[in-house]
Amino acid sequence: LSVQQGPNLLQVRQGSQATLVCQVDQATAWERLRVKWTKDGAILCQPYITNGSLSLGVCGPQGRLSWQAPSHLTLQLDPVSLNHSGAYVCWAAVEIPELEEAEGNITRLFVDPDDPTQNRNRIASFPG
């Protein structure tokens, strides 16, 4: 099982939309896939996919989840608020036929406030 996540870095303005994509691939077929999005280590949602459908479409505050066959799991945040800023990780596990799990690399989301004066030292506070 392979999970690739993108983008690595996403900078959006407050009130706009942010899209995080997780590509889940496995050489053999799977019957049920458990997926999970976390933000700063806290679980936003943990639905599963079976028969081509997600068991849940909501993922955290203002988060919508979608699955596009063959391999794309998308988390869409709309509208984005300042507290959406953080480190997002996508995780996946094939539950059936046999357990195999993997996770993506971090997507760092930066949300710029509508009021630019609130933006002081933002980049400096997130090194790397």
Partner: antibody, heavy 120, light 113 residues
């Protein structure tokens, strides 16, 4: 460019253990999302998948031969090793190693194969 | 195990004519989750290793001549060579990767009539 090369004995006696090595060049076997496989083909017959080892170290075997097979990898040498116990003349075949990726599921790169004859 | 049954065992076709090889699987190779068929076709010339031609039942590998095409879904699959060339003389195998153990068809030997 990825190349795979099988090596091992060309002749083994019945009941002996066969050890085959697949040396991978141009690509690291530690790269995530790849499976390293052994496949064999008796003369004039069909291909038969034997075993695989995944990046994580997880293994899978053909149930019909599982009790006789062990697949391992030596990352320091970039090699995948197959051992097959209790060899029999019906195990005479060309043995191939091949890779397979999660993004795909097909055998993309194959070694040239090594013919192993089992005879006393 | 998924059993792959190929037909015919051998096939003789005139140069420039169409060659059709069939592959039947003992269970569906289509996944409703990924909307893919887990079926590949390989060509093996005498003394050589197999080479991938078609993956996911109908996608031609880059560099494979467009006279080769794959079709089918579920349990019934076909490899078609629209206009046989001399270099197409080989054995052809289907292979499923829906589940392990990964299994191959018995092969079809293609010759020139």
């Amino acid at each position: 460019q990825i190349t795979l090369k099988e090596s091992g004995p060309t002749l083994v006696k019945p009941t002996q253990t066969l050890t085959l090595t697949c040396t991978v060049s141009g690509f690291s076997i530690t790269t995530g999302g790849y499976y390293w496989n052994w496949i064999r083909q008796p003369p004039g017959k069909k291909l038969e998948w034997l075993a695989l080892i995944y990046t994580s170290g997880r293994t899978s075997y053909n149930p019909s031969l599982k009790s006789r097979l062990t697949i391992t990898k030596d990352t320091s040498k970039n090699q995948v090793v197959l051992t097959m116990t209790n060899m029999d003349p019906v195990d005479t075949a060309t043995y191939y190693c091949a890779d397979m990726a999660d993004k795909g599921g097909w055998f993309a790169y194959w070694g040239q194969g090594t013919l192993v004859t089992v005879s006393s | 195990d998924i059993v792959m049954t190929q037909s015919p065992d051998s096939l003789a076709v005139s140069l420039g004519e169409r060659a059709t090889i069939n592959c039947l699987s003992s269970q569906s190779l289509f996944s409703s989750n990924t909307k893919r068929n887990y079926l590949n076709w390989y060509q093996q010339k005498p003394g050589q290793s197999p080479k991938l031609l078609i993956y996911h039942a109908s996608t031609r590998l880059s560099g494979v001549p467009d006279r080769f095409s794959g079709s089918g879904s579920g349990t019934d699959f076909t490899l078609t060579i629209s206009s046989l060339q001399a270099e197409d003389v080989a054995d052809y195998f289907c292979q499923q990767h829906y589940e392990t153990p990964l299994t191959f068809g018995d092969g079809t030997r293609l010759e020139i009539k």
